[in-house]
Interface confidence: medium
């Protein structure tokens, strides 16, 4: 069976009342098609007795059962009843091609519209069933970062996957978080990647029948140290009403510890700059956090008095960053404005 | 730990007023907000009003003419009152309380169901 | 007022998935937006809070991100406990406003 074509029963008309059970064997990855009945008035497909959606991976649709790519668990008994009806017009079973017991490669693929046979597929080599995941070749990826690598494949019968680092097999014991193999989904995937993880991985995916192999490339980026980074628009600026509780965000990233402090900007003798040309400020709280945590200053009660403006000041080992936003304190008990969460002025 | 409980009569008369209590444990109504959220049969969710930490609340504007939201700190509970109720008032009716520091809605109470009914 | 309007309304899926939901507001709310899960016959739970803060105890295959006016919740493996309904809620202007609700169920 070639890689692109697809599983379908004929007639794809309205069939004999007297339907016979079916049996039909599909190869794992096989794309599937099962028609009853004309298309505009197909009947309803059922698994195990439970009717299928109309969308998903597994879907019965205007009298088509259609499986993108068969998976174990497809396997089972499915029926298709007619439309206001419990009348059966297809009833089979499907089975998982890593079940099969060879069959001829001159056998005739359109044999298996012969009710009366227990169907197979002719023997194939293995193909990617989903070459266009496989474009990216080469993976460039900060150290701590995450990688995985796919290489979903088919045939018949069911192929391995096994991979290979730097053309060695590579199992992973010697990596420090080792590796996850899910040979389910074709892929490899390594956790908080480091300098040695550098190289080509292959992945080897072989049955009886031949084997295909890719190659992908891993390079990892080590990180240089930064002084804090935050995020774009936190804080914001923000509207409230007197007596109600604001909530001011700071998110903070950094590779080093990093070290937070809300300020309030205050004014003193009428000046909001002291001589040395640094703004007055009030420390409301400091506190050292996780890298990628929020941050944020919980104001309960908010008077007149609280309207100014707020800093969050952010430094590590290597330097300090910091970003400033208003809050605006408006007297209505209820208000009618919309505080539409404008940029925070930046004063990094 | 943090508890939030609705209590209240069942069914209300057309016309009439809605009475409400969230009793809370774990926690004082001095240090976080809480907020009144309804819930129709098989519809989504509506928040009604929110009773800030120093007493003062605010309402959305669509409920904001029949809708009063005050508390008993003593006892630790929020109350709520809503007049003039239709039949589409019928819902179940949740309190909840702010995070803290850590955003909205973050505690639930079970919800209490009211039929606005004849 | 905003509105969060959430799609799709529901969805089917199964075991192993990976599920996106997507919630957009009608205007800028910055990242003041949660994401709560509703079973059948109970009260919301928070999932999500400041669009990409996983509530504590939740599992870590639940993902919010996004900011602005577009914002999405990630189940990053379908679990049989998952089916529900999802909402998303803005908390950055008056009326606080809830979306319709994804709702996700189990093929």
């Known amino acids: 069976l070639e890689a692109s074509e697809e599983v379908e029963l004929e007639p794809c008309l309205a069939p004999s009342l007297e339907q016979q059970e079916q049996e039909l064997t599909v190869a794992l990855g096989q794309p599937v098609r099962l028609c009853c009945g004309r298309a505009e008035r197909g009947g309803h497909w059922y698994k195990e007795g439970s009717r299928l959606a109309p969308a998903g991976r597994v879907r019965g649709w205007r009298g088509r059962l259609e499986i993108a790519s068969f998976l174990p668990e497809d396997a089972g008994r499915y029926l298709c009843l007619a439309r206001g009806s419990m009348i059966v017009l297809q009833n089979l079973t499907l089975i998982t091609g890593d079940s099969l017991t060879s069959s001829n490669d001159d056998e005739d693929p359109k044999s298996h519209r012969d009710p009366s046979n227990r169907h197979s597929y002719p023997q194939q080599a293995p193909y990617w069933t989903h070459p266009q995941r496989m474009e990216k070749k080469l993976h460039a990826v900060p150290a701590g970062n995450t990688v995985k690598f796919r290489c979903p494949a088919a045939g018949n019968p069911t192929p391995t996957i096994r991979w290979l680092k730097d053309g060695q097999a590579f199992h992973g014991e010697n990596r420090i978080g080792g590796i996850r193999l899910r040979h389910q989904h074709w892929s490899l995937v390594m956790e908080s990647v480091v300098p040695s993880d550098r190289g080509t991985y292959t992945c080897l995916v072989e049955n009886a029948v031949g084997s295909i192999r890719y190659n992908y490339l891993l390079d990892v980026l080590e990180r240089s140290p930064h002084r804090p980074i935050l995020q774009a628009g936190l804080p914001a600026n923000t509207t409230a009403v007197v007596g109600s509780d604001v909530e001011l965000l700071c998110k903070v990233y950094s590779d080093a510890q990093p070290h937070i402090q809300w300020l309030k900007h205050i004014v003193i003798n009428g000046s909001s700059f002291g001589a040395d040309g640094f703004p007055y400020v009030q420390v409301l709280k400091t506190a050292d956090i996780n890298s990628s945590e929020v941050e944020v200053l919980y104001l309960r009660n908010v008077s007149a008095e609280d309207a100014g403006e707020y800093t969050c000041l952010a430094g590590n080992s290597i330097g300090l960053s910091y970003q400033s936003a208003w809050l605006t304190v408006l007297p209505e008990e209820d208000p009618t404005w919309t505080a539409a969460a404008p940029e925070a002025r930046y004063t990094d | 730990q943090v508890q939030l409980r609705e209590s209240g009569p069942g069914l209300v008369q057309p016309s009439q007023t809605l009475s409400l209590t969230c009793t809370v444990s774990g926690f004082s109504l001095t240090f976080y907000h809480v907020s009144w959220v309804r819930q129709p049969p098989g519809k989504g969710l509506e928040w009604m009003g929110v009773?800030?930490?120093?007493?003062?609340?605010t309402y959305n504007s669509l409920l904001k003419s029949r809708l009063t939201i005050s508390r008993d700190t003593s006892k630790s509970q929020v109350f709520l009152k809503m007049n003039s109720l239709q039949t589409e008032d019928t819902a179940t009716y949740y309190c909840?309380?702010?995070?803290?520091?850590?955003?909205?809605?973050?505690?639930w109470g079970p919800g209490t169901m009211v039929t606005v009914s004849s | 007022n905003t509105v969060m309007t959430q799609s799709p309304t529901s969805m089917f899926t199964s075991v192993g998935d990976r599920v996106t939901m997507s919630c957009k507001a009608s205007?800028?709310?910055?990242?003041?937006v949660g994401w709560y899960q509703q079973k059948t016959g109970q009260s919301p739970k928070r999932l999500i809070y400041?669009?990409?803060n996983r509530d504590t105890g939740v599992p870590d295959r639940f993902t919010g991100s996004g900011s602005g006016t577009d914002f999405t919740l990630t189940i990053s493996n379908m679990q049989a406990e998952d089916p529900a309904i999802y909402y998303c809620?803005?908390?950055?202007?008056?009326?606080?406003?809830f979306g319709g609700g994804t709702k996700l169920e189990l093929k």
């Open positions: 205007q800028n709310v910055g990242i003041n």
């Open positions: 400041w669009a990409s």
């Open positions: 009773i800030w930490t120093g007493g003062s609340t």
């Open positions: 909840a309380r702010g995070g803290g520091d850590r955003g909205y809605f973050a505690f």
């Open positions: 809620l803005q908390h950055n202007s008056y009326p606080w406003t």
